[in-house]
C-alpha cells in the first residue's frame, strides 16, 4: 500500500522551505491546487491556490508563499520564503476536484522553524546563502472558500508519522525520522 | 551497503521496447525519487524523469512522454523504465539515480547504478 | 528550458594545476546548482550540490562558487586521478538540465 508520509523539516527564521507534491499529472495536470495548514482539531486552511485551469509552470504568489505548477511533470512546487517561528506546522497540498471533495496529495509537511541565525540549516549540513528573486510575472489566484468536513483532522502526531492508505482506511504509526533538509535563505 | 543495481546490457530492433530494471538496496527505496538519465556514446548527460516510489506517480520531459513508463514494484524495492518505439538514437547508457527525499525539492544525485547499455540496430 | 553552458569543452593541465571551470545558466538558478564527476565508463558521481556544499568523501581540492547565472568549479591541485569529465546541473526550474561537460586531461 502506498505510505502518505509525513515529513519534518526543522528550518531558522529567515529561511525557505522548498518541497514538492506530486500528483497524477493524466488525471490532474490541469486542476486547481491548492497549500493548506492543518490546526490541530480544525479544518485544513487554504493558504495559496493556483490559478484554475491551474497554469503550467507559471508562478503564483501570494505573500511568502510562492506556488508552481509543473503540468508536464506532475509536480507542485511550493516555497515559503522567509519563514517566520509562527509558520510552525503541518501543512499539505490538495487538488480541488469540486463538486467532489479535495484530493490530498503527498506528503504531508511538518514545518518547524526556529529563531537562530539563519545561515546555519538544521543538521551538519551548510547550505549556501540564497535569495530568492520571484518573477515579475507571478500572479494572486482566487482561492475557493470550499473546504472538506471530512478533512477535519484530530491532533495529529508530534513525531513524523508514516499514514498507511489500503483503500480508504488510515492507520497511523509513529517513526522518528527527521529530515532537516538544506533549505535557502 | 546503499546501492543500486540496474540490469543487464540489450540488444534491440528499431520499433521494440526495451524495459530496464534498478534494484535498490541499503535505504528505504520509497523515501527517495529515482530518476533516469541517459547518455549516447561520447554524449553529455539527458535528464529523462524521475518517479516517486512510493506514490509511484512519475513525470517525464517533453522529449520522452509517450514513449517512457517508469513504473517501480516496492515489495522488491526496484524501479523500472521501459522505452518503447526504438529509434537508433535511442542508443545510449541508461542510468537511474537516487534524487532527494519525495518531499523535497533538492534535484541531485548522490547514488547512481552502473548504467545499462542499450543499442537500437537493425 | 533552462541551458547551461559549460567552458571550456576540454583542457589539459599539469599535476598540481588549479583548474577552473565554468558554467553559465541562460537565466537565474537560484543557486540550484551542482557538479558531478564523470570518470570513463562509469556512472556520474556527486561532488557538489548546492553551488558550494561538499558531498561526504569528496577531497577537499574540489570547490564550487558563484551565484545568479555565472558559477565555477575548481580543483585546487589537479591529481592523476581527477582524470574525468565534470558536468554542471540545475535544478532551480523543470526539466532538469545539464552542462554539456568539461574534459580534463593530464598533460
Known amino acids: 500500500a502506498t505510505k502518505l508520509t509525513e515529513e519534518k523539516y526543522e528550518l531558522k527564521e529567515g529561511q525557505t522551505l522548498d518541497v514538492k507534491c506530486d500528483y497524477t499529472l493524466e488525471k490532474f495536470a490541469s486542476s486547481q491546487k491548492a497549500w493548506q495548514i492543518i490546526r490541530d482539531g480544525e479544518m485544513p486552511k487554504t493558504l495559496a491556490c493556483t490559478e484554475r485551469p491551474s497554469k503550467n509552470s507559471h508562478p503564483v504568489q501570494v505573500g511568502r508563499i510562492i506556488l508552481e505548477d509543473y503540468h508536464d511533470h506532475g509536480l507542485l512546487r511550493v516555497r515559503m520564503v522567509n519563514l517566520q517561528v509562527e509558520d510552525s506546522g503541518l501543512y499539505q497540498c490538495v487538488i480541488y476536484q469540486p463538486p467532489k471533495e479535495p484530493h490530498m496529495l503527498f506528503d504531508r509537511i511538518r514545518l518547524v522553524v526556529t529563531k537562530g541565525f539563519s545561515g546555519t540549516p538544521g543538521s551538519n549540513e551548510n547550505s549556501t546563502q540564497n535569495v530568492y528573486k520571484i518573477p515579475p510575472t507571478t500572479t494572486k489566484a482566487l482561492c475557493p472558500l470550499y473546504t472538506s468536513p471530512r478533512t477535519v483532522t484530530q491532533a495529529p502526531p508530534k513525531s513524523t508519522a508514516d499514514v498507511s492508505t489500503p483503500d480508504s482506511e488510515i492507520n497511523l504509526t509513529n517513526v522518528t525520522d527527521i529530515i532537516r533538509v538544506p533549505v535557502f535563505n | 551497503q546503499v546501492q543500486l543495481v540496474q540490469s543487464g546490457a540489450e540488444v534491440k530492433k528499431p520499433g521494440a521496447s526495451v524495459k530496464v530494471s534498478c534494484k535498490a538496496s541499503g535505504y528505504t527505496f520509497t523515501r527517495y525519487d529515482i530518476n533516469w538519465v541517459r547518455q549516447a556514446t561520447g554524449q553529455g548527460l539527458e535528464w529523462m524523469g524521475w518517479l516517486n516510489p512510493n506514490s509511484g506517480n512519475t513525470g517525464q520531459t517533453q522529449k520522452f512522454r509517450g514513449r517512457v513508463t517508469m513504473t517501480r514494484d516496492t515489495s522488491i524495492n526496484t524501479a523500472y523504465m521501459e522505452l518503447s518505439s526504438l529509434r537508433s538514437e535511442d542508443t545510449a547508457v541508461y542510468y537511474c539515480?537516487?534524487?532527494?527525499?519525495?518531499?523535497?525539492?533538492?534535484?541531485?544525485?548522490?547514488?547512481w547504478g552502473r548504467g545499462t547499455l542499450v543499442t537500437v540496430s537493425s | 528550458d533552462i541551458q547551461m553552458t559549460q567552458s571550456p569543452s576540454s583542457l589539459s593541465a599539469s599535476v598540481g594545476d588549479r583548474v577552473t571551470i565554468t558554467c553559465q545558466a541562460s537565466?537565474?538558478?537560484?543557486?540550484?546548482l551542482n557538479w558531478y564527476q564523470q570518470k570513463p565508463g562509469k556512472a556520474p558521481k556527486l561532488l557538489i550540490y548546492d553551488v558550494s556544499n561538499l558531498e561526504t568523501g569528496v577531497p577537499s581540492r574540489f570547490s564550487g562558487s558563484g551565484s545568479g547565472t555565472d558559477f565555477t568549479f575548481t580543483i585546487s591541485s589537479l591529481q592523476p586521478e581527477d582524470i574525468a569529465t565534470y558536468y554542471c546541473q540545475q535544478y532551480d526550474k523543470l526539466p532538469l538540465t545539464f552542462g554539456g561537460g568539461t574534459k580534463v586531461e593530464i598533460k
Open positions: 537565466q537565474d538558478i537560484n543557486n540550484h
Open positions: 539515480a537516487r534524487g532527494g527525499y519525495t518531499s523535497a525539492w533538492r534535484w541531485y544525485f548522490d547514488l
